[in-house]
Amino acid sequence: IPVIEPSGPELVVKPGETVTLRCVGNGSVEWDGPISPHWTLYSDGPSSVLTTNNATFQNTRTYRCTEPGDPLGGSAAIHLYVKDPARPWNVLAKEVVVFEDQDALLPCLLTDPVLEAGVSLVRLRGRPLLRHTNYSFSPWHGFIIHRAKFIQGQDYQCSALMGGRKVMSISIRLKVQKVIPGPPALTLVPAELVRIRGEAAQIVCSASNIDVDFDVFLQHNTTKLAIPQRSDFHDNRYQKVLTLSLGQVDFQHAGNYSCVASNVQGKHSTSMFFQVVESAYLDLSSEQNLIQEVTVGEGLNLKVMVEAYPGLQGFNWTYLGPFSDHQPEPKLANATTKDTYRHTFTLSLPRLKPSEAGRYSFLARNPGGWRALTFELTLRYPPEVSVIWTSINGSGTLLCAASGYPQPNVTWLQCAGHTDRCDEAQVLQVWVDPHPEVLSQEPFQKVTVQSLLTAETLEHNQTYECRAHNSVGSGSWAFIPISAGARTHPPDE
């Protein structure tokens, strides 16, 4: 590590005196920074000597010496004060530039350490500092404004008390630059707009930025619009607002509107679409099929999408029958707005009962008139089966009635022994009825079909089973001939 003679760390001299600073190291040494013309610099073996024959207040500063060959990069420093009774300050720079929230060093160096107790920092012409200016002072370096703010970018003077009066330095201009994180923030409202020809409309493009240097414009398709700009300062940001007001819109006003703002960091834009229509409109649609089938006991949500302008004046869900005069509970109806002109209406039908099958209609109204969208809801049921023994035209006949939805198909089975249900191993014979007779087929109701099995003689040690099946499930009924007639029963649950 190099060594400076005199040993310091401070040296106080009077103006006009000769000052010699010698730096000695193991190898070659050099003085840091630009050396002013007032100094003479010469080398003497492993030492470097700075000398001046006429010290002035401008020589006040810290002198640092380094040894370039030293792997530890050591240095030595001495601070020289040239105490001039007329010049308490040596200002090293007249302008300082920092970014906001950085510490700003105002390099006014005190020429006499004795004056330290009476120093202060003021704005130009002795004005007090801005409120909450947090600063500290170092006689070697000057005043530090901590975490400088944009509005603290001012002209400052360093003040020292000498013989009961304040002596000011020349001024130092501090420029505090805002840290611009990116392009200005933008809003364009509304996000979309629909108007009937002849109505009024307003589109507002606003941009905000951390500093005042930014531009904003509103453009229609590819045309830049000439709109007066309103400026404001709010929440520590600069705002610029462009408002396009149209008294009576026409089709030429329709199209794409872009709000564009730019600053040193770049450009940011956002767009919206303005639609001009001839008259009010109201469109209802659904992503669902309007004919719905649901298994009894399950739930269903009916969803309708509405596109409308002007807004809806009324809407409701109605049950149109055919089973009862009940109406959907309002709590089961839900409305959500996707955006200004599009809405979704949902009717929740939980745990559907047989009496809730039928037609459900969503009705909506706006100045364009009424519109309705109707869903047809059919419930699916697993088949219910019953078998009876009857005589038709003198012939013994097994008559199987199956009821369900969708329409059940019917299969007869004959199996050995008496059983509630034929299993595969016992089956002796299978008859599939390709065309059972439809007894009833009303909308939204179960379909009832009938199948006949004609048997001249029924074998007593056999079971005859009617099975019905549809997409929901299956049902069956077993018939066991007995000597005293016949008995029928459904299988055990």
């Epitope: 004005r127 500092l129 801005l130 409120r131 909450h132 200016t133 703010k149 509005i151 300062f233």
Partner: antibody
Framework: QVQLQQSGAELMKPGASVKISCKAT????????IEWVKQRPGHGLEWIGE????????NYNEKFKGKATFTADTSSNTAYMQLNSLTSEDSAVYYC?????????????WGQGTSVTVSS | DIVLTQSPASLAVSLGQRATISCRTS??????????MHWYQQKPGQPPKLLIY???NLESGVPARFSGSGSETDFTLNIHPVEEEDAATYFC?????????FGGGTKLEIK
């Protein structure tokens, strides 16, 4: 929500000292200055000074140096102002108010005020 | 210290009309386009309530009938249309340098 709750009214003898408290809730106490303001009928509003609870930094109006002393307890989010050597001139309503760090900012929330009456 | 002079000291305004209060400062309180002037409303027995900050910015929750304008040394508070509940004393305050100072107040009466 931000609230500043001040201690109750005080009736004091001349020459005595009084300590007024201001309890802050609803914001980060250490990050905002607590301002103290005096109001006397016919004298308007006068700024006494301020304290930044996080650092203990204080600034006093020259006029009130030696009269007022500010302290703050960050564990209880409470700021205090002590007024000493009371005279009839100190009879007033004293307010605490919150102020963010920087010239840009106003005193956005105020306590309800503490009335101090100095009478023999 | 910066001196703030408010005028008038009192005024009476009819319901629904405009009230205009002026505040003049002994030094400029504007810096880099920011005006360090704030307005407060005070009703009897209550603390001051912030209405406008940085000359023209409406504090959250304050009705839009209050507005502020001005720069450098001349500032104005406008209330339009005046409502019954606006009867109060209004103060301006500068925050550019210590000590912060207040205007003497303007008492608004509703006719």
């Amino acid at each position: 929500q931000v609230q500043l709750q001040q201690s109750g009214a005080e009736l004091m003898k001349p020459g005595a000292s009084v300590k007024i408290s201001c309890k802050a809730t609803g914001y980060t106490f250490s990050s905002y200055w607590i301002e103290w303001v005096k109001q006397r009928p016919g004298h308007g509003l006068e700024w006494i000074g301020e304290i930044l609870p996080g650092s203990g930094s204080t600034n006093y109006n020259e006029k009130f140096k030696g009269k007022a002393t500010f302290t703050a307890d960050t564990s209880s989010n409470t700021a205090y102002m002590q007024l000493n050597s009371l005279t009839s001139e100190d009879s007033a309503v004293y307010y605490c108010a919150r102020n963010y760090d920087g010239s840009l900012y106003p005193m956005d929330y105020w306590g309800q005020g503490t009335s101090v009456t100095v009478s023999s | 210290d910066i001196v703030l002079t408010q005028s008038p000291a009192s005024l009476a305004v009819s319901l629904g009309q405009r009230a205009t209060i002026s505040c003049r400062t002994s030094e400029s309180v504007s810096i880099h386009g920011t005006h360090l002037m704030h307005w407060y409303q005070q009703k009897p027995g209550q603390p001051p309530k912030l209405l406008i900050y940085a000359a023209s910015n409406l504090e959250s929750g304050v009705p839009a009938r209050f507005s502020g304008s001005g720069s450098e040394t001349d500032f104005t508070l406008n209330i339009h249309p005046v409502e019954e509940e606006d009867a109060a004393t209004y103060f301006c305050q500068q925050s550019i340098e210590d000590p912060p100072t207040f205007g003497g107040g303007t008492k608004l009466e509703i006719k």
